[in-house]
């Protein structure tokens, strides 16, 4: 079973926007990662593999992202600062099988005027 | 390709709550059905099969539901009556393959005081 881990920073700030990092195990080869704000899907990224070493990335919501072998980071330029919102990552694992879906670590994000600080409670 | 169909009533009222019916083809054996209000996931039901005929039902959002061989009905006790909301069903098909995701029929639901009438526009 895969759970979120508190050993990474889920939120970080860059140029007035926020980067939200969704970690996954390095053993996962094909996956879908979704970022939720409360229960709203903000971003979705799917990585699948071809017969060779080719990788296909689908990003239907056109989010800015960075993909590594153990995390997907989404970049939100205008996070909702009206109130603290709860963000969490949802991981669908296609490979290795069997198919699994897991909600990963989440946290409350409070945006202040400077957008350089956040009050964060990790949910494990 | 699977699309929503207008040959069923998506909304019906019972005991002050609303039943929202999400149809799917009878050929689908393993699936996930999600109910959205706008972009918010209200309910989610996953049906998978084991090696024998055992069926596993996962209902992580603890919605009241009824599952048949061609529909999932979700029961909302306190639908948002502050304004008309757009509800739609999203179907993920695991079996038979290939994996597919489809948005099914949707409609605008306007709740009146009596909760016995709704103004509905089906989206096909």
């Amino acid at each position: 079973e895969i759970n979120g881990s508190a050993d990474h920073r889920m939120f970080s700030f860059h140029n007035g926007g926020v980067q939200i990092s969704c970690k996954y195990p390095e053993t996962v080869q094909q996956l879908k990662m979704r970022l939720f704000r409360e229960r709203e899907v903000l971003c979705e990224l799917t990585k699948t593999k071809g017969s060779g070493n080719a990788v296909s990335i689908k990003n239907p919501m056109l989010c800015l992202y960075h993909l590594s072998n153990n995390s997907v980071s989404f970049f939100l330029n205008n996070p909702d600062s009206s109130q603290g919102s709860y963000y969490f990552c949802s991981l669908s694992i296609f490979d290795p099988p069997p198919f699994q879906e897991r909600n990963l670590s989440g946290g409350y994000l409070h945006i202040y005027e400077s957008q350089l600080c956040c009050q964060l409670k990790l949910w494990l | 390709e699977i699309n929503g169909s207008a040959d069923h009533r998506m909304f019906s009222f019972h005991n002050g709550g609303v039943q929202i019916s999400c149809k799917y083809p009878e050929t689908v054996q393993q699936l996930k059905m999600r109910l959205f209000r706008e972009r918010e996931v209200l309910c989610e039901l996953t049906k998978t099969k084991g090696s024998g005929n055992a069926v596993s039902i996962k209902n992580p959002m603890l919605c009241l539901y009824h599952l048949s061989n061609n529909s999932v009905s979700f029961f909302l006790n306190n639908p948002d009556s502050s304004q008309g909301s757009y509800y739609f069903c999203s179907l993920s098909i695991f079996d038979p393959p290939p994996f597919q995701e489809r948005n099914l029929s949707g409609g605008y639901l306007h709740i009146y005081e009596s909760q016995l009438c709704c103004q509905l526009k089906l989206w096909l």
Epitope: Q30, A54, S56, S92, D95, P97 | -
Partner: antibody, heavy 121, light 106 residues
Amino acid sequence: EVQLVESGGGLVKPGGSLRLSCAASGFTFSDYFMHWVRQAPGKGLEWVGVIDTKSFNYATYYSDLVKGRFTISRDDSKNTLYLQMNSLKTEDTAVYYCTATIAVPYYFDYWGQGTLVTVSS
Amino acid sequence: DIQMTQSPSSLSASVGDRVTITCQASQDISNYLSWYQQKPGKAPKLLIYYTNLLAEGVPSRFSGSGSGTDFTFTISSLQPEDIATYYCQQYYNYRTFGPGTKVDIK
């Protein structure tokens, strides 16, 4: 009902060419990786090659035994897979199967019943 | 290319017997190994994928185990309808089949 039906097999002389077809129905052909596998009379199964889906730019990969001589192609609009075989050798004599595979999120594969190719003078 | 070896090449067993076939890969293939059953004049049928996961509709008397380079396929109680040739196949890098194991009844 899922069906894969191979056709185009027959007798051909060494050095000759042949084109096999595989007509698919009952599933979303364009979502599947399509392989050719062959089996010489009384022998085991041997993978020939594969063509990936549009998401992977229809990439093709071949076994060393056929590389440079065989070409796999597909027409998603016709739900059809092809195998163009050139410079045929007697050791290419086999039943040729087309197979469809998918692994996301569950692993499935479908096989045709095969078509016999005989290379002989 | 990854090479696959299988043993034994053939075996005879009685109905109800436990049958075991081994498969070895020339390099680490993680768990990307499947097992097929082929009856004379028929196309192969997928039984097991990813080393130990049963394909849809396959009886539970079939099972698989292993990881890396060494794998095992087991029929817990041989039935008359299990008479066939069994192949392992790696799909870690393209596809390669083992040479097959012919199973028949004593």
